[in-house]
């Protein structure tokens, strides 16, 4: 049994780090493998993560962690029974992938404006809370050629779009993702998308 692609880990900078790797052949990850991790810190214990399958040869493990601080460094050992397959380390603060924003809602009852709101995925005491910026993707299932990305570089998790910039009488979808500039993170996953019907019509005199 051998590792084809070494574990690569990302932290949500809150309580979970996710490690993914590929094996040399089909593997029952949860039955055959264990990922042991330990914070390099006085009197810390070794903790065990049971991986799940992620495709035929892929494995994924969700490591429970404490709140992340920049000094934290973990040793990682991947075992198949008594055989050590791989040994490495992981500094969560240097490999951050934010949580996806949630509760994306579209408000169409505001005159001439489509208002999108969503929730910051972090509590106010988390360092990422005030560092997130967002990208909102809007597209139309009725008009495959239409897809736009709106960058939200201010802190408030809202986006206003003039309804007149969207075609009337068709449905749109939106989704949002986040990243934290000062922590040099990757983008989060996209939030679940939400759908709305654009019924806005320009006033008669503007037609």
């Amino acid at each position: 049994m051998k590792v084809l692609q070494e574990p690569a880990c990302v932290s949500d900078y809150m309580s979970i780090s996710t490690c993914e790797w590929k094996m040399g052949g089909p593997t029952n990850c949860s039955a055959e493998l264990r990922l042991l991790y330990q914070l390099v810190f006085q009197s810390s214990e070794t903790h065990t993560c049971v991986p799940e399958n992620n495709g035929g040869v892929g494995c994924v493990c969700h490591l429970l962690m404490d709140d992340v601080v920049s000094m934290d460094n973990y040793t990682l050992d991947l075992w198949a029974g008594q055989q050590l397959l791989w040994k490495g380390s992981f500094k969560p603060s240097e490999h951050v992938k934010p949580r996806a924003p949630g509760n994306l809602t579209v408000h169409t009852n505001v005159s001439d404006t489509v208002l999108l709101t969503w929730s910051n995925p972090y509590p106010p005491d988390n360092y990422l809370y005030n560092d997130l910026t967002y990208a909102v993707n809007i597209w139309s299932e009725n008009d495959p050629a239409y897809s736009r990305i709106h960058n939200v570089t201010y802190l408030k998790p809202t986006l206003r779009i003039p309804a007149s910039t969207l075609k009337s009488g068709i449905s749109y979808r939106a989704r949002v993702r986040a990243w934290a500039q000062h922590y040099n993170t990757t983008w989060s996953e996209w939030s679940p998308s939400t759908k709305w019907y654009n019924s806005y019509r320009e006033p008669f005199e503007q037609r």
């Epitope: 810190f41 810390s44 920049s70 934290d72």
Partner: antibody, heavy 125, light 112 residues
Framework: EVQLVESGGGLEQPGGSLRLSCAGS????????MTWVRQAPGKGLEWVSS????????YYADSVKGRFTISRDNSKNTLYLQMNSLRAEDTAVYYC??????????????????WGQGTTVTVSS | DIVMTQSPLSLPVTPGEPASISCTAS???????????VDWYLQKSGQSPQLLIY???KRASGVPDRFSGSGSGTDFTLKISRVEAEDVGFYYC?????????FGQGTKLEIK
């Protein structure tokens, strides 16, 4: 009441051995790292050794490494210090102390917040 | 190893007056914001040491509020706002960032 009670001290000749015990009560013993600290007559405090809650991580002062062995029996709520190849400079009062919570991912530290009454070790010919 | 240097080593104080003890570490004891791994202990004559302050500034349970700890990184201070007769003894700072734990030399507080 949270309590630590040491025993096993005494007079021993250089090169001899002693085993100190520290019985814990009033707290979930296995959840906490434990530490031994000693104090030579008229001197300050000196850290000797520490052990994590599971016993999986052990630390020693250079002055005792290779001679002393720290261990614990969580089923008996007891910490031990096996002292071999004793030297005159090991003469001291030995204290056990309750250390950090080690079951959390990052051990939670609240200081060495409970100490035993101490047990005296005298190494002399 | 981290060296902990205390001063003064002797501190005569009049009851009711404030007292201050300094402790300097040879390297930073700051692990993360608010978490300086330095403690203060008092050892009274013939007794075991007792914890006063942990993580630089957190008062241990049952410790009178006249005791306070401050500082960050390498420089730490224990203050007693109004010394009482029962406060006499040896005061030790200790770093607990990692092994080996190291203590300061001790400060003997005595009543004038």
């Amino acid at each position: 009441e949270v309590q630590l009670v040491e025993s096993g001290g005494g007079l021993e000749q250089p090169g001899g051995s002693l085993r100190l015990s520290c019985a814990g009560s009033g707290f979930t013993f296995r959840d906490f790292a434990m530490t031994w600290v000693r104090q030579a007559p008229g001197k300050g405090l000196e850290w000797v050794s520490s052990i994590s809650g599971s016993g999986g991580n052990i630390y020693y002062a250079d002055s005792v490494k290779g001679r002393f062995t720290i261990s614990r029996d969580n089923s008996k709520n007891t910490l031990y210090l096996q002292m071999n190849s004793l030297r005159a400079e090991d003469t001291a009062v030995y204290y056990c102390a309750k250390d950090r919570v080690s079951i959390t991912i990052r051990p939670r530290y609240y200081g060495l917040d409970v100490w035993g009454q101490g047990t005296t070790v005298t190494v002399s010919s | 190893d981290i060296v902990m240097t205390q001063s003064p080593l002797s501190l005569p104080v009049t009851p009711g007056e404030p007292a201050s003890i300094s402790c300097t570490a040879s390297q930073s004891l700051l692990y993360s914001i608010g978490y300086n791994y330095v403690d203060w202990y008092l050892q009274k004559s013939g007794q075991s040491p007792q914890l006063l302050i942990y993580l630089g500034s957190k008062r241990a349970s049952g410790v009178p509020d006249r005791f306070s700890g401050s500082g960050s990184g390498t420089d730490f201070t224990l203050k007693i706002s109004r010394v009482e007769a029962e406060d006499v003894g040896f005061y030790y700072c200790m770093q607990a960032l990692g092994s080996p734990y190291t203590f300061g030399q001790g400060t003997k507080l005595e009543i004038k």
